[in-house]
């Protein structure tokens, strides 16, 4: 007896973080035997969408001409072959930016910091929000969350980094969000360039740390040390 049909692959172009009003295409790739593709969105009535396969039948295109709140969320796709439906794909999380006004990102005491010292990146929003995200450009794992512990909303979140090394240097942006949808983010803050001077140490991870040997410092999640500020916010690593 044949096993279950292999699960399809699901991805988004140009990416899974899309600004409000921009177009995005979701692709689901299955097998050449596929007769129909189905896309389901978490917490929405199913099926979310159905498409016939494109030749040579191993994938389907789901188009979103203009990104809005309705489309933000977690998706899975399936395909139907003559022997039945496939396993679901791994989930795709489609995030919309531009749902709220942009926060302000600053560095305290300064964006120019000496290696070994401390710096705190401060993300401030005009209206109270309960989730703040710090993004570092060109990092493989760019997201650092600070989320309110009990739904108490804040106007700001602090991201302390200590001790600073050359790995911390680079361009940062932050976003704010409401907990009722983690898929809706604010406009991005203006970029902040963090410049680390006087770095003499080797920035590579030491052998005692349990990281993949194939991973360089830019492939590691941003993990500042120091205590979480007493603001009711809790740190989450993505």
């Amino acid at each position: 007896q044949a096993g279950p049909l292999p699960k399809p692959t699901l991805w988004a172009e140009p990416g899974s973080v899309i600004s409000w009003g921009n177009s995005v295409t979701i692709w689901c790739q299955g097998t050449l035997e596929a007769r129909e593709y189905r896309l389901d969105k978490e917490e929405s009535p199913a099926p979310w969408d159905r498409q016939n396969p494109l030749e040579p039948k191993n994938k389907a295109r789901f188009s979103i001409p203009s990104m809005t709140e309705d489309y933000a969320g977690r998706y899975r796709c399936y395909y139907r072959s003559p022997v039945g439906w496939s396993q679901p794909s791994d989930p795709l999380e489609l995030v919309m930016t531009g749902a709220y006004s942009k926060p302000t990102l600053s560095a305290l005491p300064s964006p120019l910091v000496t290696s070994g010292k401390s710096v705190t990146l401060l993300c401030q929003s005009r209206s109270p929000m309960d989730t703040f995200l710090l993004i570092k450009e060109r990092a493989a794992h760019p997201l650092l969350h600070l989320r309110s512990e009990h739904g108490a909303q804040q106007h700001q979140a602090e991201f302390p980094m200590s001790p600073v090394t050359s790995v911390h240097g680079g361009t940062y942006r932050c976003f704010s969000s409401h907990g009722f949808s983690h898929y809706l983010l604010s406009h991005p803050s203006d970029p902040l360039e963090l410049i680390v001077s006087g770095s003499l140490e080797d920035p590579r991870p030491s052998p005692t740390r349990s990281v993949s040997t194939a991973a360089g410092p830019e492939d590691q999640p941003l993990m500042p040390t120091g205590s979480v500020p007493h603001s009711g916010l809790r740190r989450h690593w993505e």
Epitope: E43, S44, P45, A46, P47, W48, D49, R50, D70
Partner: nanobody
Framework: EVQLVESGGGLVQPGGSLRLSCAAS????????MGWYRQAPGKQRELVAA???????KIGDSVKGRFTISRDNAKNSVYLQMNSLRAEDTAVYYC???????????????WGQGTQVTVSS
């Protein structure tokens, strides 16, 4: 061939209840989200409620807490239970079927003919 057939409309007093039914062909019912739109004179068509093949529902903001939607897989039918009816609920109610994204785009694949609901004392 009529593929969606509505019934249950009529005249009801404010505060009253009605139950709309929509019968669908098996091929449509088994693979689609089923739902209801309404259109009042001179107004835009409005999505009232929808229910997916696994039973997950979405209810429009204007009727939340008053209307519920359900589907009966054995009868290939979908029902809209309308309680605490108000004058502003007066409209033609249409049964519809399709993928949910097309409900949001107001372009389901299948439409019924509509049934009139009038709320008046």
């Amino acid at each position: 061939e009529v593929q969606l057939v509505e019934s249950g409309g009529g005249l009801v007093q404010p505060g009253g209840s009605l139950r709309l039914s929509c019968a669908a062909s098996e091929s449509i019912f088994s693979s689609n989200v089923m739902g209801w739109y309404r259109q009042a004179p001179g107004k835009q068509r409005e999505l009232v409620a929808a229910v997916g093949i696994q039973g997950l529902t979405k209810i429009g903001d204007s009727v939340k807490g008053r209307f519920t939607i359900s589907r009966d897989n054995a009868k290939n039918s979908v029902y809209l239970q309308m309680n605490s009816l108000r004058a502003e609920d007066t409209a033609v109610y249409y049964c519809a079927a399709g993928a949910y994204v097309r409900f949001l785009q107001y372009s389901p694949d299948y439409w019924g003919q509509g049934t009139q609901v009038t709320v008046s004392s």
